[in-house]
Amino acid sequence: VLEVYYTSLRCRCVQESSVFIPRRFIDRIQILPRGNGCPRKEIIVWKKNKSIVCVDPQAEWIQRMMEVLRKRSSSTLPVPVFKRKIP
């Protein structure tokens, strides 16, 4: 579900949403840490309907969801985290 990308590209997100997205509509979540060309952390949600949404990292819902995923991964098997460069 979670993917962390380290990239040298500039910021990906022009517009960010804070609206809750139910998990059944989510395919995967990309986390782009700040640095390497972008001064802020970016969260990109890839939805099952093939659309993509940039989520405000400060949005309460995404922070709550990340916490749930962290707790789940620490109490069971780790959630796969993919670290790779985007060409």
């Epitope: 804070s18 809750f20 139910p22 059944r24 659309s51 309460e60 819902w61």
Partner: antibody, heavy 120, light 107 residues
């Protein structure tokens, strides 16, 4: 203008079957999840179930999944609810609704409702 | 299933009053809560989504707040046209569930 026009309601005997329809216009029907919600006389809203755009995922209220079947025909812009082995407690107004998964993620457009009466 | 407990079941207010409805989820639903307005003989209408966001065209007197298990819906200044029944709904996970409704009457 988005419209969800419902049909197929009526009087049905206990144990009988009925198929409700919901015809959509003004939206790209094939892109959206759709839901059915019902409301018994003088009661609150009860979710019946939902179907995704390509019909590969259908979720039901646990108490109804053995008797009710949700389907859709994207070529006809139509949503269906097949009700089998109906009981008196299935008497209700049935609503179809668009379950938006692009911006709001809630039920943003509703049909006018169709009344189902189960009685002998 | 996630239960949504809504209160009060009915309330009476004067025009201009501020009214508040609460909804409590039986487990964490993040901010996956919507509020609907239903007038007699009509289909429900979406007012609030994601706990606190007003749907297109909804007057600013309607607002929502909350996260986790506790949610609030407020009408800051009740108008005669607000006579209706209001429902909360969780759409965090299936089966989707509604609160029992709050019937608003005008004194």
């Amino acid at each position: 203008e988005v419209q969800l026009v419902q049909s197929g309601g009526g009087l049905v005997q206990p144990g009988g079957s009925l198929r409700l329809s919901c015809a959509a216009s003004g939206i790209d029907f094939s892109r959206y999840w759709m839901s059915w919600v019902r409301q018994a006389p003088g009661k609150g809203l009860e979710w019946v179930g939902e179907i995704n755009p390509d019909s590969s995922t259908i979720n039901y209220a646990p108490s109804l999944k053995d008797r009710f079947t949700i389907s859709r025909d994207n070529a006809k812009n139509s949503l269906y609810l097949q009700m089998n082995s109906v009981r008196a407690e299935d008497t209700a107004v049935y609503y179809c609704a668009r379950q938006d998964d692009y911006e709001y993620y809630a039920m943003d457009y509703w049909g006018q409702g169709t009344t189902v009466t189960v009685s002998s | 299933d996630i239960q949504m407990t809504q209160s009060p079941s009915s309330l009476s207010a004067s025009v201009g009053d501020r009214v508040t409805i609460t909804c409590k989820a039986s487990q964490d639903v993040n901010t996956g809560v919507a509020w609907y307005q239903q007038k007699p003989g009509k289909a429900p209408k979406l007012l609030i989504y994601s706990a606190s966001y007003r749907y297109t065209g909804v007057p600013s007197r309607f607002s929502g707040s909350g996260s986790g298990t506790d949610f609030t819906f407020t009408i800051s200044s009740v108008q005669p046209e607000d006579i209706a029944t209001y429902y909360c709904q969780q759409y965090y996970s299936t089966p989707l569930t509604f609160g029992g409704g709050t019937k608003l009457e005008i004194k």
